[in-house]
Amino acid sequence: QRLPRMQEDSPLGGGSSGEDDPLGEEDLPSEEDSPREEDPPGEEDLPGEEDLPGEEDLPEVKPKSEEEGSLKLEDLPTVEAPGDPQEPQNNAHRDKEGDDQSHWRYGGDPPWPRVSPACAGRFQSPVDIRPQLAAFCPALRPLELLGFQLPPLPELRLRNNGHSVQLTLPPGLEMALGPGREYRALQLHLHWGAAGRPGSEHTVEGHRFPAEIHVVHLSTAFARVDEALGRPGGLAVLAAFLEEGPEENSAYEQLLSRLEEIAEEGSETQVPGLDISALLPSDFSRYFQYEGSLTTPPCAQGVIWTVFNQTVMLSAKQLHTLSDTLWGPGDSRLQLNFRATQPLNGRVIEASFPAGVDSSPRAAEPVQLNSCLAAGD
């Protein structure tokens, strides 16, 4: 079974998008990853964690180039989500240098709710997206990005913070989720897996992608992050899945080519400003949206998540560079830095397009199972 690439979704046609023949099932990243020895039981095995909120960050978008993928999430095959029993957990460890338990990590003890009680909240991120259950919401208009095409100077800080690689963004990157829903981009970071093991945070019908980018934004209603944490809509994250394609992605290469310089935890370097929107899919009109949390402690809720339907394509070499260059705490590779998916607990994911409509000949009358709740709010 292949993941169809739809030619009409490819903005420039050609390049790494527009493939008509589907990928074989064997090409899909396995959800049944074998556990690492050091990994504790799955999150779902930890008491009181089934409601944990998640965290994440990353904003910005613009029309994509030939390097961007045209895979649409609604075209993915249905896969039973196995529950991620062997995936990295919401766990923290006691720092070597003291009692402080705030130095959390992926995999280890104690569980994240002990680090931050909010991590045991009911509306956490990431989640599994099931397009058939998404509520089509025509009021969700195309995202608007302004000022994302940065000049080379001033340079930007690229840091290995031990959990991810983070690019700090300058003032002036404006993003609107809709009328009156305006944000400023703060930073972007990535989540990835390891060799042969996908590492996106969100999943689609149980399918985990190789990697995921998050652009984190702060609502213009707040001056600073500390004021916005936990407030509904205070933070917004734009998320996009990264997939393997046949060509090198030149936008990502501007960052990936510098990772060796920051291989050590805590290292940072300065990189020339770049077109941040080139790191995102080109189709700003088709996306999923829901309210969740940060995917790392303190797991503050109220975060508006926007997950693009279109994916971004990187070469196999680039994905390998991403997952195999950086080092994290305790002389361990910085890999598999994703949180397990969290229960929706009654939340309905909204879609800006009719993702759940079955247009196949079998369906005499397409049915959308959920309706849009936020009619223009």
């Epitope: 705030s102 130095h103 990590r105 959990h163 700090t168 500390d226």
Partner: nanobody, 117 residues
Framework: QVQLQESGGGLVQPGGSLRLSCAAS???????????VAWYRQAPGKQRELVAV???????KYSDSVKGRFTISRDNAKNTILLQMNSLKPEDTAVYYC????????WGQGTQVTVSS
Amino acid sequence: QVQLQESGGGLVQPGGSLRLSCAASGNSANIFSFASVAWYRQAPGKQRELVAVITSAGGTKYSDSVKGRFTISRDNAKNTILLQMNSLKPEDTAVYYCNVDYLQDYWGQGTQVTVSS
């Protein structure tokens, strides 16, 4: 809102020691313990450079020029960042800034360190 205030700077002779402190106030409890914290410095006519950092994952990293002489530490209970500076050299003269990085950067106003005989 979070505010950072450095203290401990001053004039010291080469070979001497200073201990810089940075206190976070305001809503810092919301973010401090989950942030990467760092000290940067800026000498006249030069770019701001990283001196030392403790990442949100707990690792420490020092610039080559201060390794073995400076020690960074944090006290999450008191929301403070410390920089113990030993064997100071004239080239350590700069304005020192503390930084808290949690989704966005928070900066102090800086404290002057002058190493001179």
